[in-house]
Interface confidence: low
């Protein structure tokens, strides 16, 4: 028998930087966990310790903090090679800078293998980028070798900013021919390593013949054995088994997101390359494992342009951004719906000719925007500004929902109206008219959508069976203010782009900003 | 690490005002996503929020005593001010500052001060 | 005013055996609960928020469970430092507190 140990990151999301239990920045440092110093510490305790160690990342590496936002992805590759990768997956974050913001900072100057079987470039992007990034790698492990094959989301055309030239192929049809080839090669031990969500991670294993285990990413799955050591709920055991449909037992894993957890599976082989068993669990990352110096201090040195950077001028305004809890928690109020234009200017994807976008309405709480920008100060907004209004850290999200379910978020944003509570939404692409001296739950007299598959967008009733894409806050796509609807009845989800990197990037497009109350919120009865 | 600890007056009589002060330490209310908010406890009895403050000055009372209490902060001294006017026999009680998390749950406790109110 | 409602006012438990306590909301408040435990002559200690995440901290006898207006408190196998007053809290409207349970030794 030959024994392999797969350590394993994914949806890192630029927390370079150890953070909070809840992945926000770091505040108290003898409780903060993760960032990229303390990883490489237990990594090189497990290198150390054990014979047969992979390093794997499967993607969404990009986005998610000041760190994207200023290196665009170089810090992704200095670090990565650093820490000694030996492969990633590309995940749909990696394509939010266009491919250009790929290749150029990661694809070019990553030392290991950057992997996806379902993404195929056609036109003069084939040549740019050929060999930059792989179907599969073949790598040495010991005396063995191992083979590696990569899959990215096919909604990341949806997600991200992929641009014409690349297709993306459904998962399951492109892996097995490239699996088949590893066999023809003599590879028979094979990982995929991809992002595409643990419930394709699960059919990848069942139907892929010759996948012997599966490292994912994109669903951010919390798997653990036992009793959980933070705060995340296990979504099964680790590693997660699936039966494949030719009768093997395939061991799944995924090790939440934010560089929080390290993933560790061990995985037996026989020597036909057959699993004989696998255990493990995720290692949190805390405060106990120490941060290795030589990393932390290359980090310490990056982070002088951060600083630098947030007291730049992303752009103006030249009106006042009106953030306050008197009107954002109780009306329409501009900054609400500048952040809603944001979110819905970030994902504009032209990717069907029958539509405009592929989504046009926002919905955001109230109580999720933390203060004004006054337009005094020569107009001025910086990113510092911008980390006053979201302190949260989120991130701006995209979901499906019924028209039914999204009738009763609106509900419950005004169930309690009056006592300045944050469930009161913040809209756009959405037209609402509450009457408040009807009875909680039955106040939303009129609620009309933007429509997306038109050539000139008008608003049309909300139908209550029909599926809407929705951009919103991680926080309502998890169910907070007590939206418990959102969070049980959403029928997708996809996370999205740092809330202040949406909104600064929007800033710093438009230049000049001059957001309006305009009317997409309305009361029938009353003085609002 | 965190630490908060309550002052204020042992004694008070009907009528008069109470203000409390609460210093902290280990974080700074400039800080955004801090709050803090205050608690009482009567001798024997159950816990009652009374108000906090956020660091980007939103303020939230209890609305069954609002009209009595005024939440306060000085920031660059780490203190959260709580006033209660009109103070009666049944506001006798152990008042706590607390840090409030993101939601309204409190991690960290001062040790409590007793305010007793009696002519 | 969301009240929240504890039982028993009392319950007599063994050292080492496992005790539940039980907290009802008048309304739902989805899993925004948090239980503290305090003893005498102290503040109270936050265990669990958010219904069932245990505090940084917290032994693992402790854990929480439930979600909308019925949720409970668990201690697998009692100690002799778990003997104390047990609150529950709801945060999806303005906090309000159970009014305690007292776990005594038996």
């Known amino acids: 028998a030959w024994e392999l140990t797969i350590l394993h990151t994914n949806d890192v999301h630029s927390r370079l930087e150890q953070t909070s239990e809840d992945s926000s920045k770091c505040v108290n440092a003898s409780r903060c966990m993760g960032g990229v110093a303390r990883l490489f510490t237990k990594v090189q305790q497990i290198r150390r310790a054990e014979p047969n160690v992979l390093l794997l990342d499967a993607g969404d590496q990009y986005q998610g903090t000041i760190w994207f936002t200023v290196y665009k992805g170089a810090e992704v590759a200095h670090f990565m090679n650093a820490l000694r990768y030996d492969a990633m997956a590309l995940g749909n974050h990696e394509f939010d800078n266009g491919v250009e913001g790929l290749i150029e900072p990661l694809l070019k100057e990553a030392k290991f293998p950057i992997l996806s079987a379902n993404i195929k470039a056609k036109g003069p992007l084939a040549s740019q980028i050929s060999g930059l990034y792989l179907p599969y790698k073949v790598l040495p492990v010991g005396d063995e070798v191992v083979g590696i094959v990569g899959y990215t989301s096919k909604e990341t055309p949806f997600l991200s900013n992929p641009g014409t030239n690349l297709v993306f192929e459904d998962e399951i049809t492109a892996l097995q021919p490239e699996v088949d080839k590893l066999k023809t090669l003599n590879v028979n031990k094979i990982i995929a390593l991809g992002h595409s969500g643990f419930e394709m991670d699960k059919l990848i294993a069942q139907k892929v013949r010759g996948v012997d285990v599966v490292v994912g990413g994109h669903s951010n799955t919390f798997l653990y054995t036992g009793n959980p050591p933070s705060k995340e709920v296990p979504a099964g055991k680790y590693p997660f088994i699936v039966t494949s449909d030719d009768g093997r037992k395939v061991p799944v894993v995924q090790a939440y997101a934010f560089g929080k957890y390290l993933g560790y599976l061990k995985i037996e082989f026989d020597e036909r390359g057959n699993v004989i068993s696998s255990h493990g669990n995720p290692i949190l990352l805390n405060s106990s494992i120490p941060e290795d110096p030589s990393i932390k201090a290359d980090i310490n040195k990056w982070r002088i342009k951060l600083d630098n950077y947030s007291t730049q001028e992303l752009g103006k305004t030249i009106v006042y951004l009106d953030g306050s809890s008197q009107s954002c928690r109780f009306r329409e109020c501009n900054m609400g719906n500048l952040i809603c234009d944001a979110m819905i200017n970030n994902n504009l994807r032209h990717t069907d000719e029958m539509f405009w976008n592929h989504v046009s309405m926002c919905i955001l709480n109230g109580g999720g925007i933390r203060s004004p920008i006054d337009e005094r100060n020569n107009g001025t907004i910086t990113w510092e500004n911008l980390a006053a209004v979201l302190p949260f850290g989120g991130t701006f999200d995209l979901v499906q929902l019924k028209g039914s379910t999204l009738k009763k978020a609106f509900e419950h944003s005004v169930h309690r109206y009056g006592q300045s509570t944050g469930e009161f939404l913040q809209v756009g692409g959405i037209h609402v008219v509450y009457d408040l001296s009807r009875k909680p739950g039955d106040r939303v007299v009129k609620l009309d959508v933007l429509c997306t598959k038109c050539r000139v967008p008008s608003y049309d009733p909300l139908k209550m069976d029909e599926v809407y894409k929705v951009i919103l806050p991680n926080f309502l796509a998890n169910g907070g203010d007590g939206f418990q609807m959102i969070k049980d009845e959403l029928l997708r989800h996809d996370s999205g782009d740092q809330d202040i990197n949406v909104v600064s990037t929007y800033i710093s497009k438009m230049k000049v900003i001059y957001p309006a109350v305009e009317g997409r919120i309305k009361f029938s009865t009353g003085s609002h | 690490q965190v630490t908060l600890r309550e002052s204020g007056p042992a004694l008070v009589k009907p009528t008069q005002t109470l203000t409390l002060t609460c210093t902290f330490s280990?974080?700074?209310?400039?800080?955004?996503?801090?709050?803090v908010g205050w608690i009482r406890q009567p001798p024997g009895k159950a816990l009652e929020w009374l108000a906090h403050i956020w660091w980007d000055e939103d303020k939230y009372y209890n609305p069954s005593l609002k009209s009595r209490l005024t939440i306060s902060k000085d920031t660059s001294k780490n203190q959260v001010v709580l006033t209660m006017t009109n103070m009666d026999p049944v506001d006798t009680a152990t008042y706590y500052c607390?840090?409030?998390?993101?939601?309204?749950?409190?991690?960290?406790w001062g040790q409590g001060t007793l305010v007793t109110v009696s002519s | 005013e969301i009240v929240m409602t504890q039982s028993p006012a009392t319950l007599s438990v063994s050292p080492g055996e496992r005790a539940t306590l039980s907290c009802r909301a008048s309304?739902?408040?989805?899993?925004?609960v948090a239980w503290y435990q305090q003893k005498p002559g102290q503040a109270p200690r936050v265990l669990i928020y958010s219904a069932s995440y245990r505090y940084s901290g917290i032994p693992a006898r402790f854990s929480g469970s439930g979600s909308g207006t019925e949720f409970t408190l668990t201690i697998s196998s009692l100690q002799s430092e778990d003997f104390a007053v047990y609150f529950c809290q709801q945060y999806n409207s303005y906090p309000t507190f159970g009014q305690g349970t007292k776990l005594e030794i038996k």
């Open positions: 280990g974080f700074s209310l400039s800080t955004s996503g801090m709050g």
């Open positions: 607390a840090r409030r998390e993101r939601w309204a749950w409190f991690a960290y």
């Open positions: 309304q739902n408040v989805f899993t925004n």
